[in-house]
Amino acid sequence: LIIGFGISGKHFITVTTFTSAGNIGEDGTLSCTFEPDIKLNGIVIQWLKEGIKGLVHEFKEGKDDLSQQHEMFRGRTAVFADQVVVGNASLRLKNVQLTDAGTYTCYIRTSKGKGNANLEYKTGAFSMPEINVDYNASSESLRCEAPRWFPQPTVAWASQVDQGANFSEVSNTSFELNSENVTMKVVSVLYNVTINNTYSCMIENDIAKATGDIKVTDSEVKRRSQLQLLNSG
């Protein structure tokens, strides 16, 4: 969370941004809020990126002005125009690229004053893992798969029964490059699993951490997955 202040004569406005992460190939949002101003025509929003000449996006006089937009962002940005008057200057980013990572500035000017705040935008790939019982294996084993990760993550297994155990000797993890030659498919197989136990497959890089749990009993198999972005907020 980054709060910036700006001063215009006696007036300053608070601009707040949130560090966030973008998933390559999907849409992302660069979050920015400011003190609302009912005079829409008096609001100017400018998004800038460190190291880039030209603007990422500009909104002024109630409409977009993209005449100064840098070409790497052409056709890929939009503000939430109907939410500008309530203080939302967040930017929607289409088809996030690895090169979109960096430091962005959200600059605001209203009839009340002006202000700005920076945000760090990380880009990579992250996806939910899915664990299945691998019946093809000679011994009972579990297969954990996640379709898209970048940078290359670490993979670790854990078990409810054998807490603290190191499963690296009884697991095998591989990374397969996807067709776009950036992201990779993660596959990890855990061998010699026992019934009536809950196993967790944890995949983590510097952007996200994902965990897949599987509970295997004689009568049923229960699965749960979760994904959390790191260092955001």
């Epitope: 190939g25 999907e26 849409d27 030209g54 996006h57 409409k63 977009d64 002005d65 993209l66 005449s67 100064q68 937009q69 840098h70 070409e71 052409r74 056709g75 890929r76 940005t77 939009a78 929607r92 289409k94 088809n95």
Partner: antibody
Framework: QVQLVESGGGVVQPGRSLRLSCAVS????????VQWVRQAPGKGLEWLAV???????DYNAAFLSRLTISKDNSKNTVYFQMNSLRAEDTAVYYC?????????????WGQGTLVTVSS | DIQMTQSPSSLSASVGDRVTITCKAS??????VSWYQQKPGKAPKLLIY???NRYTGVPSRFSGSGSGTDFTLTISSLQPEDFATYYC?????????FGQGTKLEIK
């Protein structure tokens, strides 16, 4: 309201060039990109190119060597030039504007202008 | 290039029928799919953008769904003015591409 009007169509001889205009009103060329799409008789839609608010362009690679788009913001007009025309370029040519700046669909279309390539 | 494959290519239906047209992208396009209606001699009209957003003034009987590679346009109850050709298109990556069209005819 938003309007796009194409002009410049007609009969063009094979090997010659074609220059079309798209006059826009109801929005600013500094806010939205303008797309060019064509439709051969009895066929489907084919995207050709776009000129963005900043003036930068993107082309369908299949037409890259033959296409040039430009615009004059003060005249609210976009220009489309295609060189070395052949019979298969016979089509109705449309200019269109995006529904949002992030390009989620083409909301506003011109009426189209018919270009016939024939000797 | 991303191929957009529409099915069926033609369809006969009656007024009041529920009609579904599908569009399959050759690779993931997120939700960047739009649907258009075109009548002979006229320019296409935008019905749905962003896969599921109905454009201003489009009747509520038109709806869109899908994400990734599989998309659907549904007309819940056909009206006489709905008989036309329908196209899907993707604006996720260049070159933007369209489906080959679905001609909807009166049975």
């Amino acid at each position: 309201q938003v309007q796009l009007v194409e002009s410049g169509g007609g009969v063009v001889q094979p090997g010659r060039s074609l220059r079309l205009s798209c006059a826009v009103s109801g929005f600013s060329l500094t806010s939205y990109g303008v797309q060019w799409v064509r439709q051969a008789p009895g066929k489907g839609l084919e995207w050709l190119a776009v000129i963005w608010s900043s003036g930068s362009t993107d082309y369908n690679a299949a037409f890259l060597s033959r296409l040039t788009i430009s615009k004059d913001n003060s005249k609210n007009t976009v220009y489309f030039q295609m060189n070395s025309l052949r019979a298969e370029d016979t089509a109705v040519y449309y200019c269109a504007r995006d529904v949002t700046t992030i390009v989620e669909g083409f909301a506003h279309w011109g009426q189209g202008t018919l270009v016939t390539v024939s000797s | 290039d991303i191929q957009m494959t529409q099915s069926p290519s033609s369809l006969s239906a009656s007024v009041g029928d529920r009609v579904t047209i599908t569009c399959k992208a050759s690779e993931k396009v997120g939700t960047y799919v739009s649907w258009y209606q075109q009548k002979p001699g006229k320019a296409p009209k935008l019905l749905i953008y962003g896969a599921s957003n109905r454009y201003t003034g489009v009747p509520s009987r038109f709806s869109g769904s899908g994400s990734g590679t599989d998309f659907t346009l549904t007309i819940s109850s056909l009206q006489p003015e709905d008989f036309a050709t329908y196209y899907c298109g993707q604006t996720y990556s260049y070159p933007f591409t369209f489906g080959q069209g679905t001609k909807l005819e009166i049975k």
